[in-house]
Structure formats: C-alpha cells, structure tokens
C-alpha cells in the first residue's frame, strides 16, 4: 500500500525555548520524518511570511535584533503539496527603548485629574519606572503610571520617564509638556492717589494680579460707572462723590477672579 | 502647627439629620492643594471614608452614601461641615475630619493630621 | 470600588522582634498608599505615604514597600508603643478604601 502524503516535519530550535538577547544567535533545524513523494523544496516562513534566501533545513540567524522576534516555522513540499512544521515563537530580549510620555489631557485646568503614561517597547516588560518633573526626579513614583487627581498650577512643565527591565535601564525621552490653566490669582485692587480722598478729586484705581494662564484679557469693575479706563487694568473715577464708597476688580481669562472691594473713603470737600 | 476638631451632637433619633463641623487651624481651605476628608469608625471597627472637600470647592463623595451626604466649608472661619440626613443606627460611630495636603516630593494628595474624632450615638 | 485587603487579622510579638503587615489591592493603586497606627482610644497617625515615604517624626523602624497591587508595612524591632491597630489607605481612585486593619500586640 503506497499512501502518498505531504511531508510531516519538526523543528527543532537552539537555545530550546527560543528566548535569546538581541545580539545572540539562533539555531533552527527542520527535520524530515516522512514524506511521499520525497521532498522537493525547503523554505522558512516568519509570522507566514516567506523568508528570502532561505531554502536549507538550517535556518542560522545571527546576531538577532527585535525586530526578528515572531514565529517561524519550516516549509517542505513535494508532489502531494507542501507540509508546515509547528511554529516556534522565537522571542530576542532587549533593554528599554527611549521613552515617550503621553498626558491625558494637556492642556489641564487647576484641580481636575491628569494621567500620565510612560511608553517604553521593551521585551521583558519593563518592571520599574523613574518619573521626573522639569529635570527633577519624583519620588516614589515607580509605576507605568501617574495619577495626579487634582492638578495645581506649578505641576506645569516637562514630564519624562526612564524605564528599566531585567536587561538594562532605558534613555530618557524626549518628554511631555503638561500646560495648567487656572484663573488669575491674588487679585488686589489698589488706589493710587495719596489719601485722604476728597470730593471731587479724581481718583486712579489699578487692578493688580499676581499670575495667570493663559495671559488676562480683559477688566471688570464693580460698581458699574461712566468712568474711564485709560489702559487696561486701570480706572480713573473724574469728580469723585462722597457716595462713591467701596470698588472691586476682577481681572479675567477664561475666568473671572474678583477682588475684595476697597473702601474709598472720600471726604467733604 | 496644624490641628482639626470636630463637633457634632453626641447622640440623635433615627430618620434626624447629623450635621458636624471641623474646626482647623495651621492651614487654610483657600491655598491651593488643600482638603478636609470625613472619615468614620464604629466602634471596635475599620475605617469608612466618607467625602472630601477642596480648595477649588469641588467635591467626592463615597458613592455608598452619597445621597445622604453633603459636605461645606467657609474658608474665612476655617470650618469645614458634613450633614448626613436620615440617620439610623448604622451611623453610629466616631467621625473623623483630616486635613488632606498636597505633598511636593512625588505629588501625593495624603490625610496626613486628622482629629481626635466625635463620638455620634443613633438611638431612638 | 477598589478593595483593600490586610493580613494577618492580628499578631502578637516580642521586643525586638520584626513585624510585617500586607496590604493586597484588587487593582493597580501606583504606590497610591498610606499607612496609619492608630492606638487605643486614639486618632489614626500618618506613618507611610506613596507606599514607602515616611512621614516627618516617624520612628526609621517603620519601612514601607511594594508596587502595583501588593504593599507592605515593616517594623524593624517592635517597641512597646508600637502596640496598635493599623491600616493601608488607598488614594488611587474614589472612593478611598482602607484595609480591615491590623491588631499588633506585645507578646
């Protein structure tokens, strides 16, 4: 009885598990156990694709990179059709590449919640991270992740992260700037006039604010009047009356922040 | 130095509204990274969080309880408040306030003072 | 919500005797953990913060560990002040949680 069949096939794969570093070499061998016909080609396929120049029983790669990482198998055809080895997952180790940060979102308002992602390719996984914030490492942050809940304003600046696996310690990348935006703080309203205030002076009121982002835009003043804002941010009250007696500012961005009112003071002429 | 106190009623019927205050000193509710947390223990147990409240005003609340929870401050007399209707007997317990402070080495948020805590009694 | 759970319940040792307390999360918590004692009749004290700061004033005996989803408290060389209960305190996600607490006695 003549049973013509594809040829069956084993792999065989130096080091045994397949796991080497990147600049090791590796050792695959196809082994022929039957086949009716004989066998007529060899080939080898990565991930199913076929491999170029590749038509011996001994697939030698030398100094493998990451990128060679995949799974082979070997590829023996006769007259019946070709037969497949089983694959062999062959997996090239390498320390940490450079990191990326990725920030989820930026840019954040003041006291909502930012993550942060260091993103390193590394085989094994990378097993300890180091965080910095503008150059500056951030203590007992050694996780993939950070999680700030409530975001502050000097939290803003560059976030980079070094990754580090069993094989070596990663660079540091390039980073991720994290912008906070809040309203405009320490708002002052200030008098500019020497006191005491009389009855028909004119007075000049400055709206004085310590730091803001993005940059102020506009003023607003309470009470409301037909006074004169000769340049941003500052107001001159002509002919002031004696009912004039307290006035607040806000400087404003995307928000407003208000002043606490200032008394005037005016006295009868 | 940073010190919190709490006050409440000491004892009150079932269905009645608890309402506690926090009185603090050495920091202030206004300065950016600061919050009160309320944290309650029965007796002889472990440790419920009940909510926070923020510089910013924004507020969490233990989604267990949060329907029955209401938290406050007034940052000009340094208190903070928690109401808590329709008690029952599970209420009791002690309730603890803490400061919650931004920590600048690795950028934690932690409880790191709390009060001696109030002991609250649910009784009809 | 994420749970917190702490071994042993309880344990009991010996001056001088080092004292290990583990803190298990049901999900990653990014060192996102603290450490309270708490004695008897007393408000809970901060001890550990971010998994293995030490708070300001706290005894160096105290040491935290651990990351992802496991933690550990260490006291190297009980004290008999040290008698308390303890809990971990995790302030990854809302809600907080804390551990079922630790009772340590002096043996």
């Known amino acids: 009885l003549n049973v013509k069949h594809t040829p069956k096939l084993e792999i065989k794969v130096t080091p045994s598990d397949a796991i080497v570093r990147e600049g090791d070499s590796v050792t695959m061998t196809c082994e022929v156990s039957s086949s009716n016909p004989e066998y007529t080609t060899v080939s080898w396929l990565k991930d199913g694709t076929s491999l170029k120049k590749q038509n011996t029983f001994t697939l030698n790669l030398r100094e493998v990179t990451k990128d060679q990482s995949g799974k082979y198998c070997c590829q023996v055809s006769n007259d019946v059709g070709p037969g497949r080895s089983e694959e062999v997952f062959l997996q090239v180790q390498y320390a940490p590449e450079p990191s990326t940060v990725q920030i989820l979102h930026s840019p954040a308002v003041e006291g909502s919640q930012v993550e942060f992602l260091c993103m390193s390719l590394a085989n094994p996984l990378p097993t300890n991270y180091t965080w910095y914030h503008n150059g500056k490492e951030m203590q007992g942050r050694t996780e993939e992740k950070v999680h700030i809940p409530k975001i502050l304003p000097w939290h803003a600046g560059t976030y980079s992260c070094v990754a580090e696996n069993i094989l070596g310690t990663g660079q540091r990348g390039p980073g991720a700037e994290l912008d906070v935006q809040y309203p405009p703080k320490k708002v002052t309203t200030v008098i500019q006039n020497p006191m005491p205030i009389r009855e028909g002076d004119t007075v000049t009121l400055s709206c004085n604010y310590n730091s803001s982002n993005p940059s102020v835009t506009r003023y607003e003043w309470k009470p409301h009047g037909a006074w004169e804002e000769p340049s941003l941010g500052v107001l001159k009250i002509q002919n002031v009356g004696w009912d004039n007696t307290t006035i607040a500012c806000a400087a404003c961005n995307s928000w407003c922040s208000w002043a606490s009112p200032v008394a005037l003071n005016v006295q009868y002429a | 130095q940073v010190t919190l106190k709490e006050s409440g009623p000491g004892i009150l019927q079932p269905s009645q509204t608890l309402s506690l205050t926090c009185t603090f000193s050495?920091?202030?509710?206004?300065?950016?990274?600061?919050?009160v947390g309320w944290i309650r223990q029965p007796s002889g147990k472990g440790l419920e969080w009940l909510t926070n409240i923020w510089w910013d005003d924004d507020k969490n609340y233990n989604p267990s309880l949060k329907n029955r929870l209401t938290i406050s401050k007034d940052t000009s007399i340094n208190q903070a408040f928690l109401k808590i209707t329709n008690v029952d007997t599970a209420d009791t317990a002690t309730y603890y306030c803490?400061?919650?402070?931004?920590?600048?080495?690795?950028?934690?948020?932690?409880?790191?003072?709390w009060g001696q805590g109030t002991s609250v009694t649910v009784s009809s | 919500d994420i749970q917190m759970t702490q071994s042993p319940a309880s344990l009991s040792a010996s001056l001088g005797e080092t004292v290990s307390i583990e803190c298990l999360a049901s999900g990653g918590i990014s060192n996102d953990l603290a450490w309270y004692q708490q004695k008897s009749g007393k408000s809970p004290q901060l001890l550990i913060y971010a998994a293995s700061r030490l708070q300001d004033g706290v005894p160096s005996r105290f040491s935290g560990s651990g990351s992802g989803t496991r933690y550990s408290l260490k006291i190297s060389g009980m004290q008999s002040e040290d008698e308390a209960d303890y809990f971990c305190?995790?302030?990854?996600?809302?809600?907080?949680?804390f551990g079922g607490g630790t009772k340590l006695e002096l043996k």
């Open positions: 305190q995790q302030s990854y996600k809302y809600p907080y949680t």
């Open positions: 803490a400061r919650i402070a931004h920590y600048f080495d690795g950028y934690y948020y932690v409880m790191d003072v």
């Open positions: 050495g920091f202030s509710l206004s300065t950016s990274g600061m919050g």
